[in-house]
Interface confidence: medium
């Protein structure tokens, strides 16, 4: 599923991401835009043999199990394929664990490079939330 901007903002708010660990909803929507272009089925392979999955591009080396990433920790205790569902519950729950891990949203390279320090509220402007 490819979400609309406001549609995703509403879904993320429903799942409790607004101000989760101090990150406003705009940060999460911005991250999803530049990680996956709002596409729940996005997959991208990394040079270390791992793969990033879903709307927030969660990595198989640390967070989920895709059955083929050497040394996978699976800290979210889920199959990576669950992160590709049109229902973003699994991605959000795992993202909450990631953002609580110490580095905050710096764990997402796209957020760090494209969202951090910008007017992230623009990503939810005009949305009825």
């Amino acid at each position: 599923k490819v979400f609309g901007r406001c549609e995703l903002a509403a879904a993320m708010k429903r799942h409790g991401l607004d101000n989760y660990r101090g990150y406003s909803l705009g940060n999460w929507v911005c991250a999803a835009k530049f990680e996956s272009n709002f596409n729940t089925q996005a997959t991208n392979r990394n040079t270390d043999g791992s793969t990033d999955y879903g709307i927030l591009q969660i990595n198989s080396r640390w967070w989920c199990n895709d059955g083929r990433t050497p040394g996978s920790r699976n800290l979210c205790n889920i199959p990576c394929s669950a992160l590709l569902s049109s229902d973003i519950t699994a991605s959000v729950n795992c993202a909450k664990k990631i953002v609580s891990d110490g580095n905050g949203m710096n764990a997402w390279v796209a957020w760090r490079n494209r969202c951090k320090g910008t007017d992230v509220q623009a990503w939810i402007r005009g949305c009825r939330l």
């Epitope: 089925q41 997959t43 043999g49 895709d66 059955g67 083929r68 050497p70 990576c80 394929s81």
Partner: antibody, heavy 116, light 107 residues
Framework: QVQLQESGAEVMKPGASVKISCKAT????????IEWVKQRPGHGLEWIGE????????YYNEKFKGKATFTADTSSNTAYMQLSSLTSEDSAVYYC?????????WGQGTTLTVSS | DIELTQSPATLSVTPGDSVSLSCRAS??????LHWYQQKSHESPRLLIK???QSSSGIPSRFSGSGSGTDFTLSINSVETEDFGMYFC?????????FGGGTKLEIK
């Protein structure tokens, strides 16, 4: 136990297309990548690409882009590979395998012969 | 693409001999190297994964070693059922690639 059952041998004419199937049993089909591998005598084993059945995400070896197309049907736990514009170079044994990085589970292979 | 070069191409041995098969990668692949056995008209069978981990049901006479670019599959006291082709494969990067194979034949 994990099993991959491939469709039977095919004899096709040059220019035609063929669709090979790979039915998976014994595990959660949508969760694991399915890989496709080509074997020709004297050419060893070649990785064609992969599909994640749960999402339909696909990756292809550049060499096989435009030649192979992967699909999957999660209702029947079956992955498919279509090969188009067949030539004699496509005559080979084609295997599906469960994509665990290493391939511990293989289909029995489908022999494709392309001949006029 | 990562090239895997296997040597020798053919190895002629007598049952009871111990042998080593080599696989060399064109660049470092860490420990993401796997070994397969293939007998005529059969599918490949995983022997060793991640350089040295035995696959389930594989006899203990098969072992693997190496790191980076140079890897070895060793068979301690070859049995008649071991004759066939052996392939290495890397899963360090895409596309996945296989070595050209070593044929283990009876002398």
């Amino acid at each position: 136990q994990v099993q991959l059952q491939e469709s039977g041998a095919e004899v096709m004419k040059p220019g035609a297309s063929v669709k090979i199937s790979c039915k998976a049993t014994g595990y959660t089909f949508s969760t694991y990548w399915i890989e496709w591998v080509k074997q020709r005598p004297g050419h060893g084993l070649e990785w064609i690409g992969e599909i994640l059945p749960g999402s339909g995400s696909t990756y292809y070896n550049e060499k096989f882009k435009g030649k192979a197309t992967f699909t999957a049907d999660t209702s029947s736990n079956t992955a498919y590979m279509q090969l188009s514009s067949l030539t004699s170079e496509d005559s080979a044994v084609y295997y599906c395998a469960r994509g665990d990085g290493n391939y511990g589970y293989w289909g029995q292979g489908t022999t494709l012969t392309v001949s006029s | 693409d990562i090239e895997l070069t296997q040597s020798p191409a053919t190895l002629s041995v007598t049952p009871g001999d111990s042998v080593s098969l080599s696989c060399r990668a064109s660049q470092s692949i860490s420990n993401n190297l796997h070994w397969y056995q293939q007998k005529s008209h059969e599918s490949p069978r995983l022997l060793i994964k991640y350089v040295s981990q035995s696959s389930s049901g594989i006899p203990s006479r098969f072992s693997g070693s190496g790191s980076g670019t140079d890897f070895t599959l060793s068979i301690n006291s070859v049995e008649t059922e071991d004759f066939g082709m052996y392939f290495c494969q890397q899963s360090n990067s895409w596309p996945r690639t296989f070595g050209g194979g070593t044929k283990l034949e009876i002398k």
